[in-house]
């Protein structure tokens, strides 16, 4: 029962996380114009991975897509790639995990196969979450770098009385959505991996009894059958889970690099 609950919860958490990753990837507010030093503009800019938008005080919003591939910064391309990889892996993971759910019966699928699929989807969710967190963190780091660079030369004088205020950008809502969604997907993946342990049949020692007509003493044959889980013995399984736990710890500590923001 606990295994089913863990697996189900892992699936739901991952589903929410992947929906969040998709939402974050599609959102236009990855970076928003910093208004701290210049709150008096009647025009406001925010940018996403796919287009840039301008919102006027009038309420009019105009968005323009980045209709170029070669002209875009390599970092932006990398973030796009990470987010897409995260979505693709997450989607495949969801598909696999649906069939792996203990509460869903598909033909005569053995628990060992379900355990296998649960672990596969769990690993996919973990990698998907890591991709999203990495993508968002790379973009955040890019923003921080550009923010301080533009602060250093805040006013790019045009000579004489005229001056143009350089636009600075700060964290947009999509970054926070991405971080949370990536974290949820990661947690969901870990839960799936934990559920996998419970799904895998324990190593069972069947006592084979042989009867002989001659009336000899009964022979016991221990270990006549080993439960096949498809991924080796439980000690090997343990390594996989430990690795997963380590990965989770690494992810949780990763955003701390950006604590200075």
């Amino acid at each position: 029962m606990a295994v089913t609950a863990c697996q189900g919860l892992g699936f739901v958490v991952s589903l929410i996380g992947i929906a969040g990753i998709i939402a974050a990837t599609c959102m236009d507010q990855w970076s928003t114009q910093d208004l701290y030093n210049n709150p008096v503009t009647a025009v406001f800019n925010y940018q996403g991975l796919w287009r840039s938008c301008v919102r006027e005080s009038s309420g009019f919003t105009e968005c323009r897509g980045y209709f170029t591939l070669l002209g875009l910064p390599a970092m932006l391309q990398a973030v796009r790639a990470l987010m897409i990889v995260g979505i693709v892996l997450g989607a495949i993971g969801l598909l696999v995990s649906i069939f792996a759910l203990k509460c869903i019966r598909i033909g005569s699928m053995e628990d060992s196969a379900k355990a296998n699929m649960t672990l596969t989807s769990g690993i996919m969710f973990i990698v998907s979450g890591l991709c999203a967190i990495a993508g968002v963190s790379v973009f955040a780091n890019m923003l921080v770098t550009n923010f301080w660079m533009s602060t250093a030369n805040m006013y790019t004088g045009m000579g004489g009385m005229v001056q143009t205020v350089q636009t600075r950008y700060t964290f947009g809502a999509a970054l926070f959505v991405g971080w949370v969604a990536g974290g949820l997907t990661l947690i969901g993946g870990v839960m799936m991996c934990i559920a996998c342990r419970g799904l895998a049949p324990e190593e069972t020692n069947y006592k084979a009894v042989s009867y002989h007509a001659s009336g000899h003493s009964v022979a016991y044959k221990p270990g006549g059958f080993k439960a096949s889980t498809g991924f080796g013995s439980n000690t090997k399984n343990k390594k996989i889970y430990d690795g997963g736990a380590r990965t989770e710890d690494e992810v949780q500590s990763y955003p701390s690099k950006h604590d200075y923001v």
């Epitope: 009647a42 025009v43 840039s52 005080s57 009019f60 636009t167």
Partner: antibody, heavy 118, light 113 residues
Framework: QIQLVQSGSELKKPGASVKVSCKAS????????INWVRQAPGQGLEWMGW????????TYAEGFTGRFVLSWDTSVSTAYLQISSLKAEDTAVYFC???????????WGQGTLVTVSS | DIVMTQSPDSLAVSLGERATINCKSS????????????LAWYQQKPGQPPKLLIY???TRESGVPDRFSGSGSGTDFTLTISSLQAEDVAVYYC?????????FGGGTKVEIK
């Protein structure tokens, strides 16, 4: 069509208060901001501030804080400009204008003359 | 505040002739986000409210005759009346719509010579 209709002329004594109204029709009132512009006799145009009836946001120009209050009533699609402690230098024509795409004032009220005289 | 300086203060032009009004802002009105200049031109006749002619520096408002045109970018802008008509006698104002407070130029009075 889009119309902004302002209240009639007002003659007030110094120290009194006045409330100028601007009734909007022909569009969804909460979708666009209403700006107020002052024009003293024989002078140019001076932006006073604006309200966004959709968000409740108000912005005032530096010389128009304190005595000047912008408000609105969505139920009657009307914006208001209230001036308290009137002074002789408040004598002017007050216009309301809709803020439209391009941050442009595409529709204007006919103007309300406020005369402050003892 | 952004200072909008209009020149000349008044202008007398013969009917059918070209009238040119200049407007200079103390800061660039070109927004890098969409490459638009946030400048508008208004016409005000005596006893009437101002009427919008041009926005985004060069986009003509619907219903405005095509003899009115706007040009310029950054800090220097121009309103041109290609062939002055009697009904064009008015005061013309430029207005920046980029920074708060939104500010108007001092106005240019156009008369017939």
């Amino acid at each position: 069509q889009i119309q902004l209709v302002q209240s009639g002329s007002e003659l007030k004594k110094p120290g009194a208060s006045v409330k100028v109204s601007c009734k909007a029709s022909g569009y969804t009132f909460t979708n666009y901001g209403i700006n107020w512009v002052r024009q003293a006799p024989g002078q140019g145009l001076e932006w006073m501030g604006w309200i966004n009836p959709g968000t409740g946001e108000t912005t005032y120009a530096e010389g128009f804080t304190g005595r000047f209050v912008l408000s609105w009533d969505t139920s009657v699609s009307t914006a208001y400009l209230q001036i308290s402690s009137l002074k002789a230098e408040d004598t002017a024509v007050y216009f309301c204008a809709r803020l439209y795409y391009g941050n442009r004032f595409d529709s204007w009220g006919q103007g309300t003359l406020v005369t402050v005289s003892s | 505040d952004i200072v909008m300086t209009q020149s000349p203060d008044s202008l007398a032009v013969s009917l059918g002739e070209r009238a040119t009004i200049n407007c200079k802002s103390s800061q660039s009105l070109l927004y890098s986000g969409n490459q638009r200049n946030y400048l508008a031109w208004y016409q005000q006749k005596p006893g009437q409210p101002p009427k919008l002619l041009i926005y985004w520096a060069s986009t003509r408002e619907s219903g405005v005759p095509d003899r009115f045109s706007g040009s310029g970018s950054g800090t220097d802008f121009t309103l041109t009346i290609s062939s002055l008509q009697a009904e064009d006698v008015a005061v013309y104002y430029c207005q920046q719509a980029y920074y708060y407070p939104l500010t108007f130029g001092g106005g240019t009075k156009v008369e017939i010579k």
